[in-house]
């Protein structure tokens, strides 16, 4: 698996989505989970609903909400006030008796200011990027949410690094 | 392991490059953060590095005063501080941090790197 | 900014001595929190994480607690290499900030 990085400013929230095959993975849950070091297991963060049918409910662990489009075959994970111990290594999974499969490996960048990346240009406007090996960068800003505020899509510039 | 450059005297207004080579572990796989400590004070963060990627996140402080990149293929994180002045006189540290993170601080430090700016 | 306020500034103590420092977060920093102990020499060395967790290798007369926004390290028992200067350090938040430290003597 190649990993995509998704970089998000501290105090805002951050949306990471997974896309997978809806046929492959019908009747699966989802889960997120943040691999802790090296080697080891992926620490569950959360999962989607019990009941497959009603996996486009939003569940929050924490500050992290998961929601899942089975039809659109599209997972979302949303870090609400993102802090910079957020940043890591993560994984969206698809969940089958005591296997999990992965669907995207997910790095989160927490930046602390939208302007401190060396190619802080690409966070607002797309544009060609140095050197991230195969790595695929999802620059995601958005504004902070308030309290039981449902998030909103943010704007996304994907670019695919070779 | 993180072995940091020697010590360095250079004149006011003048910039230096100072060097942190990691080695016993996956460079790409940790942050790597900057501290300064001016003699005989506590210590300030000045900034982290993500090696993998090359983002970075600075303290307001040191915006415009330090600049911090890395050579994956050395294993190694620079820190370039330019326009000296006498405040700038410290002794700096690199600390790494954890797992494409920073969410349990800094395990592991160099032995410091000594900067003195003086005419 | 977060301010970590730590006490006290100096502290000479005997061998075998109880000794407890601490720092007050100016905000919530919800347990990222780390001490470190710095040697004469300059050497640091991360002694706890998470407000209470104990780096691997390090004695276990060193011990960490929290009681709200106070966060305390307290050494059971003086040794004659635990003389050296103490930092707390929060990672809650950007920036980072470090406490203004405490220097623990031989009294």
């Known amino acids: 698996h190649n990993t995509t990085v998704f970089q998000g400013v501290a105090g805002q929230s951050l949306q990471v989505s997974c896309p997978y095959d809806s046929m492959k993975h019908w009747g699966r849950r989802k889960a997120w989970c943040r691999q802790l070091g090296e080697k080891g297991p992926c620490q569950r963060v959360v999962s989607t609903h019990n009941l497959w049918l009603l996996s486009f409910l939003r569940r929050w662990n924490g500050s992290t909400a998961i929601t899942d489009d089975t039809l659109g075959g599209t997972l979302t994970i949303t870090l609400r006030n993102l802090q910079p111990h957020d940043a890591g290594l993560y994984q969206c999974q698809s969940l089958h008796g005591s296997e999990a499969d992965t669907l995207r490996k997910v790095l989160v960048e927490v930046l602390a200011d939208p302007l401190d990346h060396r190619d802080a240009g690409d966070l607002w406007f797309p544009g060609e990027s140095e050197s991230f090996e195969d790595a695929h960068v999802e620059h995601s800003i958005s504004r902070s949410l308030l309290e039981g505020e449902i998030p909103f899509p943010p704007t996304s510039h994907h670019h695919h690094h070779h | 392991q993180l072995q940091e450059s020697g010590p360095v005297l250079v004149k006011p207004g003048a910039s230096v490059k100072m060097s942190c080579k990691a080695s016993?572990?996956?460079?790409?796989?940790?942050?790597m953060n900057w501290v300064k400590q001016s003699h005989g004070k506590s210590l300030e963060w000045i900034g982290v590095i993500n090696p993998y990627t090359g983002a970075t996140s600075y303290n307001q402080k040191f915006k415009g005063k330090a600049t911090l990149t890395v050579d994956k293929s050395s294993s190694t994180a620079y820190m370039e501080l330019n326009s000296l002045t006498s405040e700038d006189s410290a002794v700096y540290y690199c600390?790494?941090?954890?797992?494409?993170?920073?969410?349990?601080?800094?395990?592991?430090w160099g032995q410091g790197t000594l900067v003195t700016v003086s005419a | 900014d977060i301010q970590m306020t730590q006490s006290p500034s100096s502290l000479s103590a005997s061998l075998g001595e109880r000794v407890s420092l601490t720092c007050r977060a100016s905000q919530e920093i919800s347990g990222y929190l780390s001490w470190l102990q710095q040697k004469p020499d300059g050497t640091i060395k991360r002694l706890i994480y998470?407000?209470?967790t104990l780096d691997s290798g390090v004695p276990k007369r060193f011990s960490g607690s929290r009681s709200g926004s106070d966060y305390s390290l307290t050494i059971s028992s003086l040794e004659s290499e635990d003389f050296a200067d103490y930092y707390c350090?929060?990672?809650?938040?950007?920036?980072?900030?470090f406490g203004g430290g405490t220097k623990l003597e031989i009294k």
């Open positions: 016993g572990y996956t460079f790409t796989d940790y942050y």
């Open positions: 998470a407000a209470s």
């Open positions: 600390a790494r941090g954890t797992y494409y993170s920073n969410y349990e601080g800094f395990p592991y």
């Open positions: 350090l929060q990672y809650a938040s950007y920036p980072y900030t």
